[in-house]
């Protein structure tokens, strides 16, 4: 689980370059309690 | 009633392991990420990491690289966490949280 | 890390009147696609926490609307317009621009 932060708010994980908060308007539940299906 | 229920509190000594639960009950817990947080006595939140069910990849904090463990047991609907080497500041409530349910919280005592 | 802070960490607030928590962020939340990702939390005693606020100004479902938030990118304040007997607890900014760090808490109580 290589994890490298970068200033720039995104990071390197498992080799690819993700912005870590950009899944928050998904339907994955990234947002801590937030219920999924509500209103986003 | 949907809810996460977790196991119950936990002592262990130093250097031990743990392995939290979190069971979701009228709820599938392999469907949405689910995050563990601890909160230190008297203290603040503090976020561990997040593991997507569906393909067990996982993002920690950096500090507990090394210190905790996520899984999903998919055919159980239940999660989990270990933590290893344990030392006494490990001493804490733990939270599961999925979508908008969070666990009732599990303390784990490190102490010899 | 972004580093949270709060002040006050201790709000002594009386019933029906309004209150307000400051959450300060060590680098800009606000991200280039217009989101700000900073996050009210609230834990009441003996409870587990819930999520209030989301993405600075969203309401959290069931969450009533006399809570507010706004700010800037570094600055943001949690309002409540009357404070009502069920509101103690301790209330905790949150950001997850980078991961998820918390700030340290404020202890809101009756007076």
């Known amino acids: 689980d290589a994890e490298f932060r970068h200033d720039s708010g995104y990071e390197v994980h498992h080799q690819k370059l993700v912005f870590f908060a950009e899944d928050v308007g998904s339907n994955k539940g990234a947002i801590i309690g937030l219920m999924v299906g509500g209103v986003v | 009633q949907v809810q996460l229920v977790q196991s119950g509190a936990e002592v262990k000594e130093p250097g031990a392991s743990v392995k939290v639960s979190c069971k979701g009950s009228g709820f599938n817990i392999h469907t949405y990420y689910v995050h563990w947080l601890r909160q230190l006595p008297e203290k603040g939140l503090e976020w561990i990491g997040r593991i997507d069910p569906e393909n067990g990849e996982t993002i920690y904090t950096p500090k507990f690289q090394d210190k905790a463990t996520l899984t999903v047991d998919t055919s159980t609907d239940t999660a989990y966490m270990e933590l290893s080497s344990l030392r006494s500041e490990d001493t804490a409530v733990y939270y599961c949280?999925?979508?908008?349910?969070w666990g009732q919280g599990t303390l784990v005592t490190v102490s010899s | 890390d972004i580093v949270m802070t709060q002040s006050p960490l201790s709000n002594p607030v009386t019933p029906g009147e309004p209150a307000s928590i400051s959450c300060r962020s060590s680098?800009?939340?606000?991200?280039?696609?217009?989101?700000?990702?900073l996050y009210w939390y609230l834990q009441k005693p003996g409870q587990s926490p819930q999520l209030l606020i989301y993405q600075m100004d969203h309401l959290a479902s069931g969450v009533p609307d006399r809570f507010s938030s706004s700010g800037s990118g570094t600055d943001f304040t949690l309002k409540i317009s009357r404070v009502e007997a069920e509101d103690v607890g301790v209330y905790y900014c949150?950001?997850?621009?980078?991961?998820?760090?918390f700030g340290q808490g404020t202890k809101v109580e009756i007076k």
């Open positions: 680098k800009s939340l606000l991200h280039r696609n217009g989101k700000t990702y």
């Open positions: 949280v999925s979508s908008g349910y």
């Open positions: 949150a950001q997850n621009l980078e991961l998820w760090t």
